[in-house]
């Protein structure tokens, strides 16, 4: 279970659209799939496919659903309680330090190293030194541009709040 979870944008409700009102907030909070009304008296449903909330909350607006970028595939659609899950296309990966884009996996390891891990949607190929068996973390020649792997990063983006 990874730890790369990014804050999502707040999406103002479209005032013209009909809003489904639910029961009053409990302890000032509304259940997942809802947000609180401006006067704090009602819980209003998020709009399926448009926005969502994953937790009990006092959000004034639900969170805007992520749209998968080109170069990504949609693993699961956005619901009122869960954001879209996007994953990098085959041959590309998303690293923790730049979660906003998928990067091409390296095609091979630098000289003197062997491949011990394949390209996945969340990590580059993994290379180790032939002799020592230690992972590669330094610079390599410019022709083999290195991208640091980030194993364990989930299909992204996803939202997490505590």
């Amino acid at each position: 279970e990874s730890a790369l979870i990014t804050q999502q944008d707040l999406a103002p409700q479209q005032r013209a659209a009909p809003q489904q009102k639910r029961s009053s907030p409990s302890e000032g909070l509304c259940p997942p799939g809802h947000h609180i009304s401006e006067d704090g008296r009602d819980c209003i449903s998020c709009k399926y496919g448009q926005d969502y909330s994953t937790h009990w909350n006092d959000l004034l607006f639900c969170l805007r659903c992520t749209r998968c970028d080109s170069g990504e595939v949609e693993l699961s659609p956005c619901t009122t309680t869960r954001n879209t899950v996007c994953q990098c296309e085959e041959g590309t990966f998303r690293e923790e330090d730049s979660p906003e884009m998928c990067r091409k996996c390296r095609t091979g390891c630098p000289r003197g190293m062997v491949k011990v891990g394949d390209c996945t949607p969340w990590s580059d190929i993994e290379c180790v030194h032939k002799e020592s068996g230690t992972k590669h973390s330094g610079e390599v020649p410019a022709v083999e541009e290195t991208v640091t792997s980030s194993p364990g990063t989930p299909a992204s983006p996803c939202s997490l709040s505590g």
């Epitope: 279970e1 730890a3 790369l4 979870i5 990014t6 804050q7 707040l10 409990s26 302890e27 909070l29 609180i36 994953t54 937790h55 009990w56 909350n57 006092d58 959000l59 004034l60 607006f61 979660p99 997490l160 709040s161 505590g162």
Partner: antibody
């Protein structure tokens, strides 16, 4: 009274296990994501783990991943932290903290327990 | 991972002084920053969230500002009860990261 109370700390040898508990009262426990945060003696704060309100998702700091397991029992208003393969560097006061998910922010902690001290030493 | 760097690590000021603590993120975090106060032997207490929103019950002499990578906690008039260590924390994404802390003492 709105509070979190940790228990289960103590002295343990390296490589052994310990389970911490955090009892919640005064609020609806099942509405909140709850975190563990630790503080080594004389040091700063370090986030350890979080579990979602319904237990459906758990996330860990790299330093404890694969060794610690966070869980909860909403029927008992209790949070747990199972700590295995303990190391000297895990010595710290462990706090449980309530995470806040609101219109202006998500991840800050608005309620902390008093903490329980875990000492890993041979 | 995003690193949070606080400065200074400690400071000493007189009662009534204006005290400023800074927190810098290694990458932009919008305004997803909280400040906590931890008095000696006590539990951390939330002071400010969303970079500048004062938590209920916190004295108005505390204020926060900043966005992106640079943030500031200001105590407009230092009081004896403000002796504590102050921590910033970013919460735009996991892992949640705290600054190293700033210890505030009275001269």
């Amino acid at each position: 009274q709105v509070q979190l109370v940790e228990s289960g700390g103590g002295v343990v040898q390296p490589g052994r296990s310990l389970r911490l508990s955090c009892a919640a009262s005064g609020f609806t426990f099942s509405y909140y994501g709850i975190h563990w945060v630790r503080q080594a003696p004389g040091k700063g704060l370090e986030w350890v783990a979080v579990i979602w309100y319904d237990g459906s998702n758990k996330y860990y700091a790299d330093s404890v991943k694969g060794r610690f397991t966070i869980s909860r029992d909403n029927s008992k208003n209790t949070l747990y932290l199972q700590m295995n393969s303990l190391r000297a560097e895990d010595t710290a006061v462990y706090y449980c903290a309530r995470g806040r998910y609101s219109s202006s922010s998500w991840w800050y902690f608005d309620l902390w327990g008093r903490g329980t001290l875990v000492t890993v030493s041979s | 991972d995003i690193q949070m760097t606080q400065s200074p690590s400690s400071l000493s000021a007189s009662v009534g002084d204006r005290v400023t603590i800074t927190c810098r993120a290694s990458q932009g975090i919008s305004n997803y920053l909280a400040w906590y106060q931890q008095k000696p032997g006590k539990v951390p207490k939330l002071l400010i969230y969303a970079a500048s929103t004062l938590q209920s019950g916190v004295p108005s002499r505390f204020s926060g500002s900043g966005s992106g990578t640079d943030f500031t906690l200001t105590i407009s008039s230092l009081q004896p009860e403000d002796v504590a260590t102050y921590y910033c924390q970013k919460y735009n994404s996991a892992p949640l990261t705290f600054g190293g802390g700033t210890k505030v003492e009275i001269k």
